[in-house]
Interface confidence: medium
């Protein structure tokens, strides 16, 4: 809306940088062959690049990433009883970001 | 995978709390009748509840919200020339979060 301008502060661009995000740990990251288990914790924090760039033709992208293995519980349900095992999930953290030109493929002439 | 357990730290649950997120300001928030304009900035930071709860039947939800009006530039393109106007967009910030029971509708018997 165009109303109530006086009370509104000028919007500040969300700069392109790393922010803490929540990553859902899906079961197929651990075992694609079996669905009869639960994962704990179901979500973890990761660092990810987000935000906008000063130009329409550029995009906020990770310029440096780090893989971080973490242990989760794989809770298998066998005959209605749980069996607790450890599993390793590798998370991707973004360490640095940059505004990168979007390369659009040229049409073939 | 169940390999390389030694190097991996135990995963820590992403607790239910407010985190800084990036909100894309879509054009239809400003004017649904006209697509012939740009918005600046294209994205801003907001506070939003995210994360997981310690229980299967609960979900991380906002328990307190605040509406925050911000001024953006509406850049209309008229005869290939830009016309700058102000517009107000109301953002929703989450101030507090809680793990709330998911109410699943009971089947009608």
């Amino acid at each position: 809306s165009l109303g109530s301008l006086a009370a509104a502060e000028p919007a500040v661009i969300a700069e392109c940088k790393t922010r803490t995000e929540v990553f859902q740990i899906s079961r197929n990251l651990i075992d694609r062959t079996n669905a009869n288990f639960l994962v704990w914790p179901p979500c973890v924090e990761v660092q990810r690049c987000s935000g906008c760039c000063n130009n329409r033709n550029v995009q906020c992208r990770a310029s440096q990433v780090q893989m971080r293995p973490v242990q989760v519980r794989k809770i298998e349900i066998v005959r209605k009883k749980p069996i607790f095992k450890k599993a390793t999930v590798t998370l991707e953290d973004h360490l640095a970001c940059k505004c990168e030109t979007i390369v659009t493929p040229r049409p073939v002439t | 995978s169940l390999g390389s357990l030694a190097a991996a730290e135990p995963a820590v649950i992403a607790e239910c709390k407010t985190r800084t997120e990036v909100f894309q300001i879509s054009r239809n928030l400003i004017d649904r009748t006209n697509a012939n304009f740009l918005v600046w900035p294209p994205c801003v930071e907001v506070q939003r509840c995210s994360g997981c709860c310690n229980n299967r039947n609960v979900q991380c939800r906002a328990s307190q919200v605040q509406m925050r009006p911000v001024q953006v530039r509406k850049i209309e393109i008229v005869r290939k020339k830009p016309i700058f106007k102000k517009a107000t967009v109301t953002l929703e910030d989450h101030l507090a979060c809680k793990c709330e029971t998911i109410v699943t509708p009971r089947p009608v018997t």
């Epitope: 519980r73 009883k81 749980p82 450890k86 | 135990p10």
Partner: antibody, heavy 120, light 107 residues
Framework: EVQLLQSGGGLVKPGGSLRLSCAAS????????MSWVRQAPGKGLEWVSY????????YYADSVKGRFTISRDNSKNTLYLQMNSLRAEDTAVYYC?????????????WGQGTLVTVSS | SYELTQPPSVSVSPGQTASITCSGD??????VHWYQQKPGQSPVLVIY???KRPSGIPERFSGSNSGNTATLTISGTQAMDEADYYC?????????FGGGTKLTVLG
């Protein structure tokens, strides 16, 4: 204050019954799994029974299976252990304890313990 | 049934490092927790998920777990650390405790 307050212990004859209670306060009881753990005089800790947050899952140590029943009343914030057909070897201090998650995990809060003596 | 084995006793001089082991078949595949119990008191969680420390537990307590052995390490042991220590793991639908280790702080 976050605590577990136990009651119901005492002296009982072999073959007799007893019900232990564990009243929770200071936290949302219905969000946590609970267990009973016992300790015979001068001995180590022995896990007895587990119940999930909503009471749908219950597990028992082989030594008490068929004789002990774990239950909970989330509306009263209370955990119970019904002990039947008691034997001399059930003599122990019984602790109720809280798991931080619905599925179990470590025991992060313990009751003060209550002594159960089975003797004729 | 699954068994966890601990040494009955460990002695250490004040200020030294005490290590208490807990062994079980493929124990590294399970999360191990450690409890401290002083005479006449309820147990207290000191390490969970192999190596995590609950709030309020001093930094001198640490843990590790791989292969068939989990270890509780107390660095700079103090007289107040004298207690019984129990390892625990949730395996096949039951919580299993080790037999316990009596830690004696000499002097």
């Amino acid at each position: 204050e976050v605590q577990l307050l136990q009651s119901g212990g005492g002296l009982v004859k072999p073959g007799g019954s007893l019900r232990l209670s564990c009243a929770a306060s200071g936290f949302t009881f219905s969000s946590y799994a609970m267990s009973w753990v016992r300790q015979a005089p001068g001995k180590g800790l022995e896990w007895v029974s587990y119940i999930s947050d909503d009471g749908s899952l219950k597990y028992y140590a082989d030594s008490v299976k068929g004789r002990f029943t774990i239950s909970r009343d989330n509306s009263k914030n209370t955990l119970y252990l019904q002990m039947n057909s008691l034997r001399a070897e059930d003599t122990a201090v019984y602790y109720c304890a809280r798991h931080p998650y619905w599925y179990g995990g470590q025991l992060d809060l313990w009751g003060q313990g209550t002594l159960v003596t089975v003797s004729s | 049934s699954y068994e966890l084995t601990q040494p009955p006793s460990v002695s250490v001089s004040p200020g030294q490092t005490a290590s208490i082991t807990c062994s079980g078949d493929s124990l590294g595949s399970y999360f191990v927790h450690w409890y401290q119990q002083k005479p006449g008191q309820s147990p207290v969680l000191v390490i969970y998920d192999d190596s995590k420390r609950p709030s309020g537990i001093p930094e001198r307590f640490s843990g590790s777990n791989s292969g068939n052995t989990a270890t509780l390490t107390i660095s700079g042991t103090q007289a107040m650390d004298e207690a019984d220590y129990y390892c625990s793991a949730f395996t096949h639908n039951s919580d299993v405790f080790g037999g316990g280790t009596k830690l004696t702080v000499l002097g």
